[in-house]
């Protein structure tokens, strides 16, 4: 082979604000976080603090009641789903602080960001189960008296969790770490390797099963429940219904941006300006969805204060009052301290 000095003319001026440029040294890259990322970090911090403490408290309160109170079983499972998701937040927080660098490895990349989707599916399936329960209490009170028990409630929860895990698998499988050449950075994200159809399919399934179908069915469900409740002019407390409606509403509100951006990105080219804009908002949308993981304990406390007039009781007893209300006089053949209604009123209980 010929041996000669290979030289190339040096560069003139470059006005390219680039991180990988022909004349940009390695250490000359930007260290400022984008505004959406800063907002996401603030939300993550708040959600983590409120979510871990709030859901831990809900778990503690409802765990003791779950053997005999069906409402406690529902709220316990919701709290566990939220608590689990909150555990991933310190890692997600750290990654955003490091400009989305992911030093935690491939396994963590597959598992931790998938927890919020597991939470989404678990939450909506549990909310659907709770809503079905509320519906049956209103429209099939005799059936509820005979068959509505803790055992059946736990089976329903187990089915919800199983389905949630199944629905999370696609997102889990397509999550990969991508190592960028310059600046040296490892990114954790989804990779459908060219297959836009598969990416769209996953996004559509997520939108339909995790948002649109539940939104439609739960809206119909609560319309019927509320109509029946108002027509009967129920005199007993409707606090569980109010709490459940608030939880359901918050679910859809906080998941909306994530779902909208997700479906849009699946139909856009990765190099298109709209895609790149939405990608910048991704962390913010995820953090907004994460508010679901801390909002329930807040709803319970607000509801408790509303029902109590003002916060006279300790937080655990206030939560216990909201979360373990009996919907049918004899649940699991036992009375609880919150059962004060007469048999005549019980059929109107929602």
């Amino acid at each position: 082979m010929d041996s000669f000095n290979y030289t190339t003319p040096d560069y003139g001026h470059y006005d390219d604000k680039d991180t990988l440029d022909l004349n940009t040294p390695v250490d000359k890259t930007s260290n400022t976080l984008r505004v959406p990322d800063i907002l996401a970090l603030v939300i993550f911090a708040v959600v983590f603090l409120v979510g871990v403490l709030g859901n831990a408290l809900v778990v503690w309160v409802t765990a003791f009641e779950a053997k005999r109170t069906i409402n406690a079983i529902w709220f316990l499972n919701l709290a566990v789903a939220d608590f689990l998701s909150c555990l991933a937040l310190p890692i997600l927080f750290t990654s955003i602080v490091q400009h989305h660098h992911w030093p935690f490895g491939g396994a963590a990349c597959s598992i931790l960001p998938s927890l919020i989707l597991l939470n989404m599916y678990a939450s909506i399936l549990l909310l659907a189960t709770i809503s079905a329960d509320r519906f049956l209490l209103v429209f099939k009170p005799i059936w509820c008296q005979n068959f509505r028990g803790a055992g059946l409630a736990w089976i329903a929860c187990a089915v919800a969790w199983g389905l949630a895990l199944l629905l999370t698998i696609p997102s889990f499988l397509y999550r990969v770490v991508r190592e960028e050449y310059f600046p040296p950075k490892v990114l954790c994200g989804v990779d459908y390797s060219h297959d836009k159809r598969r990416e769209r399919a996953v996004a559509i399934v997520r939108l339909v099963l995790g948002f649109l179908w539940p939104l439609l069915t739960l809206t119909i469900c609560y319309t019927f429940i509320l109509l029946r409740t108002w027509s009967r002019r129920a005199t007993r407390s409707t606090k569980t219904l109010k709490v459940v409606v608030a939880v359901v509403a918050s679910f859809f509100i906080f998941w909306l941006p994530y779902q909208v951006t997700g479906i849009m990105m699946s139909f856009l080219e990765p190099s298109s300006p709209t895609f790149l804009l939405l990608k910048k908002l991704d962390s913010l949308c995820v953090s907004f969805a994460y508010i679901n993981c801390c909002i329930n304990p807040i709803i319970y406390v607000v509801a408790g204060q509303g029902f109590q007039g003002r916060l006279r009781k300790s937080l655990p007893s206030l939560l216990r009052n909201v979360l373990t209300e009996e919907s049918v006089v004899r649940e699991s053949k036992s009375f609880t301290r919150s059962t004060v209604d007469t048999m005549a009123q019980k059929t109107q209980a929602v």
Epitope: T8, T19, F182
Partner: antibody, heavy 116, light 112 residues
Framework: QVQLQQSGPELVKPGDSVKMSCKVS????????IDWVKQSHGKSLEWIGY????????KYNQKFKSKAALTVDKSSTTAYMELHSLTFEDSAVYYC?????????WGQGTLVTVSA | DVVMTQTPLSLPVSLGDQASISCRSS???????????LHWYLQKPGQSPKLLIY???NRFSGVPDRFSGSGSGTDFTLKISRVEAEDLGVYFC?????????FGAGTKLELK
């Protein structure tokens, strides 16, 4: 003017090691990666890895992790690549190039021939 | 690893013809900085590769304007508007978005 001057051709026996050099001039040595690329006869280019002189960090292509060792001598602005346990498949031209971006500046290449 | 698929492997042309080389990557080359690090090199016999186009469409200094690059995401093209004798050689596409940096198999531009 950016220049990368590589050491001359090497004829080695299977199982031996070889160390080639790449003398850099014309820019701040510690500001950019030094990347190494392999080209077997009549074949495409394969990226071996880079060495970042500023912090001593190296990144290897998984394929070459146990084959190549990258080092630098900052005082002489020279990069080195040592190839271990050579086999006939290691016979190729090895280029050094300035990295941290598209490979705009290349050395002339070092031909390594592995022969019994 | 990102696989770079170049077509055609051989491109016979006459001087003055237009030439087009395609390069497809196995995954998106959009970097987190929003840039796409897809480059084109020309290697003549017995020489080192030389940079022609960087970041999809930017001509390197000294490269004639008959060379142009285009594309986005995973599909890229190098065009030579009027082939000259000095353009003959092997053209490689390469990505430096992800580790490891990878190259296409090469397209040999030769006279008919």
């Amino acid at each position: 003017q950016v220049q990368l001057q590589q050491s001359g051709p090497e004829l080695v026996k299977p199982g031996d090691s070889v160390k080639m050099s790449c003398k850099v001039s014309g820019y701040t040595f510690t500001d950019y990666y030094i990347d190494w690329v392999k080209q077997s006869h009549g074949k495409s280019l394969e990226w071996i890895g880079y060495f970042y002189p500023n912090n001593g960090g190296a990144k290897y292509n998984q394929k070459f992790k146990s084959k190549a060792a990258l080092t630098v001598d900052k005082s002489s602005t020279t990069a080195y690549m040592e190839l271990h346990s050579l086999t006939f498949e290691d016979s190729a031209v090895y280029y050094c190039t300035r990295g941290s971006g598209p490979f705009a500046y290349w050395g002339q290449g070092t031909l390594v021939t592995v022969s019994a | 690893d990102v696989v770079m698929t170049q077509t055609p492997l051989s491109l016979p042309v006459s001087l003055g013809d237009q030439a087009s080389i395609s390069c497809r990557s196995s995954q998106s080359l959009v970097h987190s900085s929003e840039n796409t690090y897809l480059h084109w090199y020309l290697q003549k016999p017995g020489q080192s590769p030389k940079l022609l186009i960087y970041k999809v469409s930017n001509r390197f200094s000294g490269v004639p304007d008959r060379f142009s690059g285009s594309g986005s995401g995973t599909d890229f093209t190098l065009k030579i508007s009027r082939v000259e004798a000095e353009d003959l050689g092997v053209y490689f596409c390469s990505q430096s978005t992800l580790v490891p940096v990878t190259f296409g198999a090469g397209t040999k531009l030769e006279l008919k």
